[in-house]
């Protein structure tokens, strides 16, 4: 297959890092973390058609070369740039779905309705979802022991980089009405330190976004307050009106019901409110 | 002052093969995409292949260019190179190489561009 | 494959006249609006214009302008002046990081 051909190519031993070196408060890097971008890059190229031609050989080097030899408290955005445009994806801008803290709803969403794209239906935030990675600065080593956590080491990590700069593109690149997923079972319904609060929103484009729209998704069965009406809700309104879009928001009181008449929206009983 | 300058094109034979160099001078080279463009005699314009060399060379090609054409980089001698093997009558064209702009906000287009080297196959 | 089709692919006009060149792509661009507008003149390298669809490149007079999005775009030449005879290309940027050039319009004097 393709991608035996990649790694007989390529004759790469990843070697992990030895216990002695420097300690990082997060998990390492994902076992076998070259051999997932790797094909996980060759399924979704086979899968969409317009990504048909991305090279993965090139996309895992760009990705390698990212965070390989750089120290992990050292990483920028432009380190990431390569990989960006090797990864660049013309998705259709007025069918973006953002989402904080509630991934995997926003997931089964989209996976219903196919014409629906979150970041990680896109191939750069397929190859990275649910992984962890880092290097070592002067070393061509990756390291499987630990990694820094964005709290308790720094910020500037492989990983919250890469979540920061590919976010951003995402929502520069959406248009018309954009949709965000929040979770209305948490304390901040709305969190403008998480990366839809403090990336995404800031990057999404006036001249381009008409409307974001907000679906506050209820988690108690029995739960029929108006959580638009949330103070962190008329916060995210307030710096959404601040940059000339306008905000509309809607409570998913059923999020069980809510995806139900997503796939099937001719029963009669998704006539009345979800 | 920004400049790029292409060498080596020629007459060629068809099945032939010819190198084409594109020196850089007056900026950062490593910090830029580098992209060969073609154009053939009277016709409109054709992206050939893309490098980026921060770290390792990070390049990719047009489809209808890949297996015949190779872009490499020398950062010591500040040269991109254009490798072109199995040539055929319509690869005959004046043949640039361009300097992306830089930024996430600018990438996808060329600001600077060299004077051109034709090939004739 | 991508095809970008400009239309006219001439055009004549009188100094001071407005002129409107218009770019279609087979498939949106990047973002909706990566596309991009060069000028050539005869053996030489194209010049950047705008780029973003609308945006001027520096030092190109304000008679430039561009509007569109998605698969269709124009460039507008407000007045044009003896210096703008010459080649326009659209230039689109697409998924994969990859290029795509319409087959130009050349815009010469009636």
């Known amino acids: 297959s393709g991608l035996n051909d990649i790694f007989e190519a390529q004759k790469i031993e990843w070697h992990e890092v030895p216990r002695w070196r420097q300690q990082w408060s997060g998990p390492g890097t994902t076992k076998r973390f070259p051999e997932t971008v790797l094909a996980r890059c060759v399924k979704y190229t086979e899968i969409h058609p317009e990504m048909r031609h991305v090279d993965c050989q090139s996309v895992w080097d760009a990705f390698k070369g990212a965070f390989i030899s750089k120290h992990p408290c050292n990483i920028t955005e432009e380190d990431y740039q390569p990989l960006m445009k090797l990864g660049t994806q013309t998705v259709p801008c007025n069918k973006i779905l953002l989402w904080s803290r509630i991934k995997d709803l926003a997931h089964q969403f989209t996976q219903v309705q196919r014409d629906m794209f979150t970041l990680e239906d896109t191939l750069l935030g397929y190859l990275a979802d649910d992984l962890t990675w880092c290097g070592e600065f002067n070393t061509s080593k990756i390291n499987y022991q630990s990694c820094p956590d964005w709290r308790k080491d720094c910020s500037n990590n492989p990983v919250s980089v890469f979540w920061k700069t590919v976010s951003r593109r995402f929502a520069e690149a959406a248009c018309d009405v954009v949709h965000v997923m929040l979770n209305g079972s948490r304390s901040k319904i709305f969190d403008k330190n998480s990366t839809f609060g403090s990336v995404e929103v800031h990057n999404l484009q006036p001249e381009k976004v008409q409307t974001l729209e907000a679906w506050v998704i209820h988690g108690g069965r029995e739960d029929s307050r108006d959580l638009c009406q949330d103070p962190t809700i008329k916060e995210l309104e307030s710096i959404i009106s601040k940059r000339n879009i306008q905000f509309s928001c809607k409570n998913i009181y059923r999020p069980d019901k809510f995806l139900q008449c997503v796939k099937n929206p001719e029963d009669s009983s998704c006539t009345s409110e979800i | 002052e920004v400049q790029l300058l292409e060498s080596g094109g020629g007459l060629v034979q068809p099945g032939g093969s010819l190198r084409l160099s594109c020196a850089a001078s007056g900026f950062s080279f490593n910090n830029y995409w580098i992209i060969w463009i073609r154009q053939a005699p009277g016709k409109g314009l054709e992206w050939v292949a893309a490098?980026?060399?921060?770290?390792?060379?990070?390049?990719y090609y047009a489809d209808w260019a890949k297996g015949r054409f190779t872009v490499s980089k020398d950062n010591s001698k500040n040269t991109v190179y254009l490798q072109m093997n199995s040539l055929r009558a319509e690869d005959t064209a004046v043949y640039y190489c361009?300097?992306?702009?830089?930024?996430?906000?600018?990438?996808?287009?060329?600001?600077?561009w060299g004077q051109g080297t034709l090939v004739t196959v | 494959d991508i095809q970008l089709t400009q239309s006219p692919s001439t055009l004549s006009a009188s100094v001071g006249d407005r002129v409107t060149i218009t770019c279609r792509s087979s498939q949106s661009v990047y973002g909706h609006n990566w596309l991009a507008w060069y000028q050539q003149k005869p053996g030489k390298a194209p010049k950047l214009l705008m780029y973003r669809a609308s945006n001027l490149a520096s030092g190109v007079p304000s008679r430039f302008s561009g509007s569109g999005s998605g698969t269709e775009f124009t460039l507008t030449i407000s007045s044009v002046q003896p210096d703008d005879f010459a080649t326009y290309y659209c230039q689109g940027y697409y998924s994969g990081g990859s290029y795509a050039f319409g087959g130009g319009t050349k815009v010469e004097i009636k």
């Open positions: 361009a300097r992306e702009l830089s930024g996430s906000a600018y990438e996808g287009y060329f600001e600077s």
């Open positions: 490098i980026y060399s921060p770290s390792g060379d990070i390049k």
